[in-house]
Structure formats: C-alpha cells, structure tokens
C-alpha cells in the first residue's frame, strides 16, 4: 500500500531499519551512533549551503521475538515485518537505510512498490545486483568476481606471467554473511567467474582442502577462500603445502593488515590476501574507536548512507526539485559524494566502488606488503611491487596448473 512520506515542507526524515538479523554482529547502539554522527555532518553541510531544513532519523526496531537468530538466516521475514510496521504507522521517511542481509533486501525489494531509495550496508549477493532503487555501500560479490577474473587473466606483470583458468573454492557453510555471498557468487554455475574459468571445484569439507595442499594430482594450484588468518590456520594448521600452491584469502573488511606492528605468521607465506584499501581518519573517529577492524566498515557504511542522502537532498533542494518522486528514488547512483573518510563513488547500479588491495607476505620482513591494487570503477589492475620477495620460485606466481609451460 502507498505510505505517506515524511519528506517535505523543510522536514526530511530517514527511516533506519534496526534489524536483529544483521550482516555483522554489531550492537545496534553503535549503528545509532554512526547514524547520529552522519546526521550532524549533513545538517552542517546543508546549513553551509544556505538550506534551512530539518533532517532527522527514525530508528525502526523489530520486536526480535520471532526473528532472533542474530545472523541473516531469518532476516527475510524480519525485513517485511518492519516494512509492515512502517506501513501501519503510516510513517515512512524519504529514504530507507536498512537491511544488510541479502535475503531481506531481495525480498523487501521484490514485495514492495519502491518509490523511495533503499540504502544498504551489505546485501552482498548477486540477487541484489542491478536493482534500480537500491544502493549498496559495501563491496558486493559482483565486484569481487570482476577482480578475480581480471587477475586470473593477467599475464604481463613481472610477478605474474601466466594466465590462470582454474581454481578451487573452499566453502564449508560456516562463513560470515559477506563471505557466504562472495563464495556463493564464485560457486554459481551461471556467474561471470564460472563462465570465464575452464575448471572450478568447490571444496566443502576441511579434509578436501587439506588433501589438496599436497595432492600431486590436483587440477589447480589456486585455492580461493574467505576469512582472516586465524580462519585459515584453523583449517590448514601446520600442514606442509606444495611450493606452487597459491591461496587467495578474501578478507575485504579488515584494516589490520596495514597496521605498523603487524607481523605475518609463517602459515601466511603461500597466501595472497585480498582486502580493501584502508580509510585515513577512521581510527580516531568518535564512533569507531571501540569497533573492531571489520565492524568499522559496517558502521561507516551506515554513516556514509546518511551522508549520501544528505548529498542527494542538497542537490534536489538546490535545483528546486521534489524529493518524493521516482526521479529522486532512482538518483542514488553514478555519482561521487563526500563520504566520512573521503570521496565515495557509486557505479551505474548504485554499488560502491573501491580500491581492492592484494597483499603478500614478504619472506624477508614477515610483513604484509602491497602487491597490486585494483580499481573496481574502471576494472583495472595497478602493480605496486615489481620485485616482490615471494616464497614462490623466482619471485613469480606459479602457473595454475602444475607442469604446464608458458601460456
């Protein structure tokens, strides 16, 4: 049903869904703090632009009685229940900042006539791609896939002279929400990644993964997995690893690798870590001081969602345009706005673009070093360390298939 929006006459409201089921186990209080910090910034920016308007947020909490798994498994109905609550209260803001779970976002998008923009900190799955009024402020699976295909095909770098066309993917079902959808996308037979690879097998058991590490008959030297170093160690332990194995560890939302005093443990020497370029000022900000390196990105996405709304509101008000129109709902894409930690770019489909960073462990210093960066906006790789101190032979990444000559 049509719900009137609190979105006119100089008063603009943001509906923030505070769902018990969330992509990251973050206390809702921290997300509230992030939203409130964002509101302060937006109010200041609008005032500086000479726009004398009111911007507020309404936090919509679910009762948590039915949907209490805490993760995303029971989020589908929770999102719809919250929308029903908004509908019954006849109280909808100009924008919905909310569901981080792929299940809930997909279902909410499907089951509602969205004439308002939806901003998500999460919704990583491919099923949330190409949604006309959905904006995602954390790297979705599609971006990861495009990097991997780009990197697999690269063969003209001093440290990577072979194109790759094969991979194992380790996916055991215990992953975090982001990892679950990243690996899901790699597993999907119809995905771009699967389409571009000649061979891909999903390893679902710990033993399968462990056996591959020294299996002379393995079909690929490359294994993709998702998580942090500790996750890898629990799986791999102190087992020997064949010298031409390359483990790609996807750990996008973790700034820790860039801290000065971090030392890479021995078991990381065969590993390339894919993460995001860290923010500049986040460590000292009031809302993020007590957050873990992963949760910083989640809270930041909420904060940036508020700043994005403020950016769009400012543009529409300055142009004398109506906010409660399909044009506004469809406008949250193909733009760059000033985020909390610098410019944030959204692609044509409203998904955040970022700089991904591939790290390796220096055998000399035991430090994580940047091997290359990848700009998701232009789908381009930029080598950084032209003579890396790799563990691999001749300081070059091996071929993906043992015994195969130059391609």
């Amino acid at each position: 049903s049509q719900v009137s929006q609190n979105c006119h006459n100089g008063s603009y409201e943001i509906s923030v869904l505070m769902m018990g089921n969330s992509a990251f186990a973050e206390p809702l209080k921290n997300l509230e703090d992030a939203v409130n910090e964002g509101l302060e910034i937006v109010r200041g920016r609008l005032q500086n632009a000479g726009l004398n308007v009111t911007v507020n947020a309404t936090f919509m909490y679910s009762d948590g009685l039915i949907h209490n798994s805490g993760d995303c498994r029971s989020s589908t109905c929770e999102g719809l229940d919250l929308l029903r609550k908004i509908s019954n209260a006849q109280r909808m803001g100009c924008v919905l900042i909310g569901p981080s779970c792929t299940y809930s976002t997909f279902q909410m998008y499907l089951d509602t006539e969205l004439s308002y923009p939806m901003i998500s900190a999460g919704s990583f799955g491919l099923s949330c791609d190409y949604k006309e009024t959905l904006t995602r402020l954390m790297s979705p699976a599609r971006k990861l896939m495009y990097f991997l295909v780009n990197f697999w095909k690269t063969n003209d770098l001093p440290f990577k002279t072979y194109s790759w066309s094969t991979s194992y993917v380790y996916k055991n079902g215990t992953e975090t929400e982001d990892c679950f959808w990243y690996l899901n996308a790699l597993e999907a037979s119809v995905s771009y990644f699967s389409h571009e690879l000649g061979f891909k097998v999903v390893l679902r058991q710990d033993k399968e993964f462990q056996d591959i590490l020294m299996d002379h008959n393995r079909k690929s030297n490359v294994i993709i997995m998702c998580g942090g170093p500790e996750f890898l160690y629990k799986l791999k332990g102190d087992r020997a690893v064949a010298e031409d194995i390359v483990i790609i560890l996807v750990d996008l939302f973790n700034d820790q690798y860039f801290e000065d005093n971090v030392t890479a443990p021995d078991y990381m020497k065969n590993v390339l870590v894919l993460t995001l370029s860290p923010g500049n000022s986040l460590l000292n900000s009031s809302f993020s001081r007590n957050l873990s390196p992963t949760k910083r990105d989640f809270a930041l996405a909420y904060l940036n969602g508020i700043l994005l709304f403020g950016h769009m509101l400012k543009i529409f008000l300055e142009n004398g345009e109506n906010i409660t129109t399909p044009k506004f709902a469809h406008a949250f894409r193909n733009l760059t706005f000033e985020g909390y930690d610098g410019p944030v770019t959204l692609d044509d489909w409203g998904d955040v673009d970022s700089t991904m960073v591939l790290l390796y462990t220096s055998v000399d210093t035991k430090k994580y070093k940047v091997l290359l960066t990848y700009d998701t906006h232009v789908n381009k790789t930029y080598p950084v360390d032209m003579s890396p101190t790799f563990t691999w032979k001749n300081s070059k990444l091996p071929n993906d298939i043992t015994g195969r000559g130059p391609q």
């Epitope: 500790e230 160690y233 332990g237 102190d238 971090v262 030392t263 443990p265």
Partner: nanobody, 115 residues
C-alpha cells in the same frame, strides 16, 4: 598493553636442570606460536625451541633431547624445561609469543651454566 614476564633463570652447574616460565599479561588475543630464543654475549639471538597451537614443536639441533618446550594457550604461558645443561647454554633467554597478528617479546632471563 601486553607484557611478557620470564622467570626461572639462575646460575646452575653443568649437568643441572632449570625450568623457565613466561607469562603474558594483558589482552593478547588468539595465540599462533610460542617460543624461546637465546642470546649469548657477542652473538646473534638464536632459536631454542618453538611450539604452535597446532601442536608442532621445533628445536635447535644443539638442544634436541635435552630441552622440552610446553605451551598453555589458554593461560598464555610457555615453559622451557632444560636438562643436562652445558656451559655453552649460558645466555639470556627470551620468550616470544606470536598471535595471528602480532609478535611479543619478553625482557629476558639470565641462565648461567658454570661450575
């Protein structure tokens, strides 16, 4: 602030035994490996023994069969049982704890083997 405190160093006669202990205070996180290193005057610091949380132990050739390392991850402590001590074992012994992210060193405890 994490601190490692070693104890157990002493003056002992050749053939004697000592047990070194190292305890971490503060929030250290999940431990990957613990170890003992030593540095004799005018020499480089060298590995004595290490143990990982996965159960792998590693000893310097010169101490194999005489020294035993044991770690207690739950209590953030590591021990080094040293038997059949020799004069060449004289050194400052340092404990090292490595989490999955950080490396911590103790201040060292002096072991002197002399008659």
């Amino acid at each position: 602030q994490v601190q490692l405190v070693e104890s157990g160093g002493d003056l002992v006669q050749p053939g004697g035994s000592l047990r070194l202990s190292c305890a971490a205070s503060g929030s250290i996180g999940s431990i990957y490996a613990m170890g003992w290193y030593r540095q004799a005057p005018g020499r480089q610091r060298e590995l004595v023994a290490t143990t990982t949380s996965g159960g792998t132990t590693n000893y310097a050739d010169s101490v194999k069969g005489r020294f035993t390392i044991a770690g207690d991850n739950a209590k953030n402590t590591v021990f080094l049982q040293m038997n059949s001590l020799r004069p060449e074992d004289t050194a400052v012994y340092y404990c090292k704890i490595q989490t999955h992210w950080y490396v911590y060193w103790g201040q060292g405890t002096q072991v002197t083997v002399s008659s």
